[in-house]
Amino acid sequence: SPVPFGPEGRLEDKLHKPKATQTEVKPSVRFNLRTSKDPEHEGCYLSVGHSQPLEDCSFNMTAKTFFIIHGWTMSGIFENWLHKLVSALHTREKDANVVVVDWLPLAHQLYTDAVNNTRVVGHSIARMLDWLQEKDDFSLGNVHLIGYSLGAHVAGYAGNFVKGTVGRITGLDPAGPMFEGADIHKRLSPDDADFVDVLHTYTRSFGLSIGIQMPVGHIDIYPNGGDFQPGCGLNDVLGSIAYGTITEVVKCEHERAVHLFVDSLVNQDKPSFAFQCTDSNRFKKGICLSCRKNRCNSIGYNAKKMRNKRNSKMYLKTRAGMPFRVYHYQMKIHVFSYKNMGEIEPTFYVTLYGTNADSQTLPLEIVERIEQNATNTFLVYTEEDLGDLLKIQLTWEGASQSWYNLWKEFRSYLSQPRNPGRELNIRRIRVKSGETQRKLTFCTEDPENTSISPGRELWFRKCRDGWRMKNETSPTVELP
């Protein structure tokens, strides 16, 4: 069913409802060279065949050139994220040319009409690039197209139509409706640039997915699984953002891609890393924290160029705001026996103690179920850099702490009144840091005491063999 939109109607209605009463529209695409970090400055307008503005506005032919391409608009004005991105690019690449592609008149339409206009806008950008290529020292390899939502597909068209190959296209949550499953020439795809990297932040497997779910680049990064973004829940939105409606939740999650990219520009000392994985569930299990064979990468501007034979889906967790970086850990817990488990899955928490800091109490998400006589893998992440890990506290939540478990406990008791206490035996926990790729084994403090039961805790310290390093590379940041 479609995503509800409260009293304002459904999302589909919003997609097809123009905000403005329109008189005759001059179909237009403008290229605004942002000449100043001051967001209020009017900038310079470039047009094909007119070289004077290039000279007047000090267009740097040898520098990087960014084209920022907005998406569909309900208001007809530039959204506030655009100025953040312009400012971040100016901060990071002081000599670069930052060009805003203004296609507001063609984007401020019914969603379906705006989609149909993307091809025209792509052609306009390609013509501008073809003209710039005629100038000495201008290289298409220095061109980086950054498209948000519908703008990502505009970038794809531009890359497809231009004579030659642009250096890079970044798709920031490319639009989903009317593009999901489309032919590669009718959407952003890997052959539109030398390197196409994509951030997916609003994908939904139910209802209407605002962002495209399918991978469309050389690397496709799905922060927090590509769907529910921290800090964008209805409660968060009610407290901080205008409206506080489901509309704003959608906007928050969709726009998160832009903020992750901005974060990568302004907080390059705090890079976020994504890890290759076949799907979100496997990532949540902690299986995919390897950096071998290019299996991890920085996200956003600092992403290393990877031209894979097929799309590479990558995942990571993030904080709710800038800086978005978190520290990922894979925890392998070998359960060698358990007693009287019944039908209740245990609820485990870990606290990590490090040389720099201690973590909060972190839940171990059981994606499927705890397996006996097997190694169970979990993903945990912390917002702070703990340094080298020293010890781990594992806690089994008591049944009374969870109403759901209390009910299951009661049902279990009714069926087996003399059910003795449940117990699990764990000798060691193996931990791998995603960010450093270091592996460490932790053993129980008391080798004789390896059992844990509801409401109890078990302490683990670094085993005597200390750090165990495999021949794996850590995700070093290679700046573009």
Partner: antibody, heavy 120, light 111 residues
Framework: QVQLVQSGAEVKKPGASVKVSCKAS????????MNWVRQAPGQGLEWMGW????????TYAGDFKGRVTMTTDTSTSTAYMELRSLRSDDTAVYYC?????????????WGKGTTVTVSS | DIQLTQSPSSLSASVGDRVTITCKAS??????????MHWYQQKPGKAPKLLIY???NLASGVPSRFSGSGSGTDFTLTISSLQPEDFATYYC?????????FGGGTKVEIK
């Protein structure tokens, strides 16, 4: 210097229409949007809408939809606001004010205002 | 639409006084670290004039005795030492979303 020059005062009968002009000078007309704001006697400021001077696309405030038309003539750098089916409560000073397409979109330059009196 | 409530609606003050006017928005007018709140001065029979933009930035040609502060939903315009030419009506305005809206105004009169 940057300025917006508005047309002179108008006296209209209820049901009639009025068209106010705003001629811009000292800057590139199409590089800024044009807003229209009105102020009834002794009252506050009320935004009526704005027009993208490059594309000619207007956006109207809900209270004025269907009754107002905003247009531009880029050859003379002039913006126009026409209000139809005038009522006595449309008696006000009508201002044009420019705002940037970029940044925080405040109204940095205002016309002196055009007084429109609606009286039978 | 975002509602802006100014207080007081009018005040009487003397030359040299410190004057503070507040503006409260019905919801946040911040985007990241930017505030989309602005202040205008209007004298009788004249057009409004931009005083402060983005909560705290002084517009070109505006004397330094005017200052703005605040974030989120609460904003303040301060005149550190009131001058004879400052007797006017002051309006706050938000532009974080269309429609832009104005506060009801604060009339500063001579005591």
């Amino acid at each position: 210097q940057v300025q917006l020059v508005q047309s002179g005062a108008e006296v209209k009968k209820p049901g009639a229409s009025v068209k106010v002009s705003c001629k811009a000078s000292g800057y590139t007309f199409t590089n800024y949007g044009m807003n229209w704001v009105r102020q009834a006697p002794g009252q506050g400021l009320e935004w009526m809408g704005w027009i993208n001077t490059y594309s000619g696309v207007p956006t109207y405030a809900g209270d004025f939809k269907g009754r107002v038309t905003m247009t531009t003539d880029t050859s003379t750098s002039t913006a126009y606001m026409e209000l139809r089916s005038l009522r006595s409560d449309d008696t006000a000073v009508y201002y044009c004010a420019r705002r940037g397409y970029y940044g925080r979109r405040y109204f940095d330059v205002w016309g002196k205002g055009t007084t429109v009196t609606v009286s039978s | 639409d975002i509602q802006l409530t100014q207080s007081p609606s009018s005040l009487s003050a003397s030359v040299g006084d410190r004057v503070t006017i507040t503006c409260k928005a019905s919801q946040s007018v911040d985007y990241d670290v930017d505030s989309y709140m602005h202040w205008y001065q209007q004298k009788p029979g004249k057009a409004p004039k931009l005083l402060i933009y983005a909560a705290s930035n002084l517009a070109s040609g505006v004397p330094s005795r005017f200052s703005g502060s605040g974030s989120g939903t609460d904003f303040t315009l301060t005149i550190s030492s009131l001058q004879p030419e400052d007797f006017a009506t002051y309006y706050c305005q938000q532009t974080i979303e269309d429609p832009p809206t104005f506060g009801g105004g604060t009339k500063v009169e001579i005591k």
